[in-house]
C-alpha cells in the first residue's frame, strides 16, 4: 500500500503581508495527479474555497482581488488525487497592513551613528498596542518582533542596537499591532534612514546604503542586538 500523498506547497504573491485593498494570489502546488484543490482558512467553515487545477494540473490559484481584514488569517491547502486527499500543506499566515494608524519611528540619540557605538530605534504608536515589528527595507521578514507580557498595552517599543556596524546602515520602518489579531498590522511608519560612519579606530568611511525602493529580500536580514528593552515587551526573533 502506498504511503500518504505528499503535502502540497502553499504560498502567496506578492507576499504574505499585504496592505489593505491590494490584490493577492494564493497558490497551492501539489502533483500532476491532482484533480481538485481545496483551501481552508482557520476558524472559517471548510472548505474556504475549491479550485480546479491549472494545466499541467500541479497547482491551483486562489485570488483575492482586494485585501480586507476578513481575508487575514491562517490558511492550509489540500489536493485530491485518484487515491484520495493529500496531507495538509504547511500553514500560510496572511497578514494585512493598514488596519491601524501608522506609528512613528525615531533613533536615539540620533540616526547618525558612529560604528562601534550604540543606537536605539524607538517605535511609538498614538494608541496603546501590544506588538511592534521593526523591518529593514528590502528585508523579507521583520527583524524584531516585540510583544508585551500578559497583553499589557504599550505606546512604544525600543529596539537597541549595540555595537553598531556598517551593515546596520539602511532604511527602517516599524509596524504596530493588537494581540487579539496578529494578522492585522498598522500602516508602516515613515522611513528612518540609519547612517553609520566609520569609527576612530577605522577612519575609512563605511559604505552606507542609500535609501532604496528595491523590494527584493536581503540574503541575511540583520538582527539588532542588545538587552531586552525596559518596556514590558518580550523579544521574539523572527
Amino acid at each position: 500500500q502506498a504511503g500518504p500523498l505528499p503535502k502540497p506547497t502553499l504560498w502567496a504573491e506578492p507576499g504574505s503581508v499585504i496592505s489593505w485593498g491590494n490584490s493577492v494570489t494564493i497558490w497551492c502546488q501539489g502533483t500532476l495527479e491532482a484533480r481538485e484543490y481545496r483551501l481552508d482558512k482557520e476558524e472559517s467553515p471548510a472548505p474556504w474555497d475549491r479550485q480546479n487545477p491549472l494545466e499541467p494540473k500541479n497547482k491551483a490559484r486562489f485570488s483575492i482581488p482586494s485585501m480586507t481584514e476578513d481575508y487575514a488569517g491562517r490558511y492550509r491547502c489540500y489536493y485530491r488525487s485518484p487515491v484520495g486527499w493529500s496531507q495538509p500543506s504547511d500553514p500560510l499566515e496572511l497578514v494585512m497592513t493598514g488596519a491601524y494608524s501608522k506609528p512613528t519611528l525615531s533613533a536615539l540619540p540620533s540616526p547618525l551613528v558612529t560604528s562601534g557605538k550604540s543606537v536605539t530605534l524607538l517605535c511609538q504608536s498614538r494608541s496603546p498596542m501590544d506588538t511592534f515589528l521593526l523591518i529593514k527595507e528590502r528585508a523579507a521578514h521583520p527583524l524584531l518582533h516585540l510583544r508585551s507580557e500578559h497583553g499589557a498595552q504599550q505606546h512604544q517599543a525600543e529596539f537597541p542596537m549595540s555595537p553598531v556596524t556598517s551593515v546596520h546602515g539602511g532604511t527602517y520602518r516599524c509596524f504596530s499591532s493588537h494581540g487579539f489579531s496578529h494578522y492585522l498590522l498598522s500602516h508602516p511608519s515613515d522611513p528612518l534612514e540609519l547612517i553609520v560612519s566609520g569609527s576612530l579606530e577605522d577612519p575609512r568611511p563605511s559604505p552606507t546604503r542609500s535609501v532604496s525602493t528595491a523590494a527584493g529580500p536581503e540574503d541575511q536580514p540583520l538582527m539588532p542586538t542588545g538587552s531586552v528593552p525596559h518596556s514590558g515587551l518580550r523579544r521574539h526573533w523572527e
Epitope: G15, I18, S19, G21, S66, H187, G216
Partner: antibody, heavy 121, light 107 residues
Framework: QVQLQESGPGLLKPSETLSLTCTVS????????WSWIRQPPGKGLEWIGY???????NYNPSLQSRLTISVDTSKNQFSLKLSSVTAADTAVYYC???????????????WGQGTTVTVSS | DIQMTQSPSSLSASVGDRVTITCRAS??????LAWYQQKPGKVPNLLIY???TLQSGVPSRFSGSGSGTDFTLTISSLQPEDVATYYC?????????FGQGTKLEIK
C-alpha cells in the same frame, strides 16, 4: 540604477495591433509590478494595466477586451499588445515599475522615457 | 471604479508662495495615494507615496497629507523649477486611476 526602455513601432494604421516592449536594465524584473501608462497629446496620464513578475495581470477595464500584457523574465522584458487600435490610442506610452516591500507598496518609482505611438490612416 | 478628482485644474503662484493641491477619491482608499510631478516634455516623477511618505531625493518643501478620501499636496515655498503638472494616483486595488492633473505656473 534601474532603467526602463520602451521600444516598438511609432506609426500604426487603424485596426492594427500595437506591440510595445519594455526592457529592464540594471536590475531584476523580480519581484516587482510592471505597469504601462499612456498620455494622449496635451492630456493627462491613463493607467493601462500591470503585470506582476510571475505573470499575474490586471487591466484597465476600458481597455481589457483589447489588451494583453506579458512578461519574459529570461530577457528582463515585459510587453504590451493592444489590438484594433484607433486614433484615440495615439499617445506617449510609458512603462514603469512599482515595488512591493513587507506589507506596503511604493508608487511608480522608475519610469521609461516613453515612446510616441501615432495611429493614422 | 473609484474616481480621482484634483483641484484646481490649474493655478498660478509666485516664487516663495505656499501652494496646495487637493485630490479627492470617490471612495475610501486609506493612504494608498501617490503624487507625481511631470515637467513640460519630461517623464512623470514620483514625489510622494503612502499619501505622506517623501520619495528619496525629493526636496523637503514637498509634503503630502490625508487619508480616506481627501488628500493634499503642499509645496511650502514655490521654486521656479516646480513649474509642472501634478497628478495624484490611487494604487491599491486596480485600476490604479490617476487624477486629471493640476497645472502649476509661476506668476
Amino acid at each position: 540604477q534601474v532603467q526602463l526602455q520602451e521600444s516598438g513601432p511609432g506609426l500604426l494604421k487603424p485596426s492594427e495591433t500595437l506591440s510595445l516592449t519594455c526592457t529592464v536594465s540594471g536590475g531584476s524584473i523580480s519581484p516587482y509590478y510592471w505597469s504601462w501608462i499612456r498620455q494622449p497629446p496635451g492630456k493627462g496620464l491613463e493607467w493601462i494595466g500591470y503585470i506582476y513578475y510571475s505573470g499575474n495581470t490586471n487591466y484597465n477595464p476600458s481597455l481589457q477586451s483589447r489588451l494583453t500584457i506579458s512578461v519574459d523574465t529570461s530577457k528582463n522584458q515585459f510587453s504590451l499588445k493592444l489590438s484594433s487600435v484607433t486614433a484615440a490610442d495615439t499617445a506617449v506610452y510609458y512603462c514603469a515599475r512599482r515595488g512591493y516591500s513587507f506589507g506596503f507598496y511604493y508608487g511608480l518609482d522608475v519610469w521609461g522615457q516613453g515612446t510616441t505611438v501615432t495611429v493614422s490612416s | 471604479d473609484i474616481q480621482m478628482t484634483q483641484s484646481p485644474s490649474s493655478l498660478s503662484a509666485s516664487v516663495g508662495d505656499r501652494v496646495t493641491i487637493t485630490c479627492r477619491a470617490s471612495q475610501d482608499i486609506s493612504i494608498y495615494l501617490a503624487w507625481y510631478q511631470q515637467k513640460p516634455g519630461k517623464v512623470p516623477n514620483l514625489l510622494i507615496y503612502l499619501a505622506s511618505t517623501l520619495q528619496s531625493g525629493v526636496p523637503s518643501r514637498f509634503s503630502g497629507s490625508g487619508s480616506g478620501t481627501d488628500f493634499t499636496l503642499t509645496i511650502s515655498s514655490l521654486q521656479p523649477e516646480d513649474v509642472a503638472t501634478y497628478y495624484c494616483q490611487k494604487y491599491n486595488s486596480a485600476p490604479w486611476t490617476f487624477g486629471q492633473g493640476t497645472k502649476l505656473e509661476i506668476k
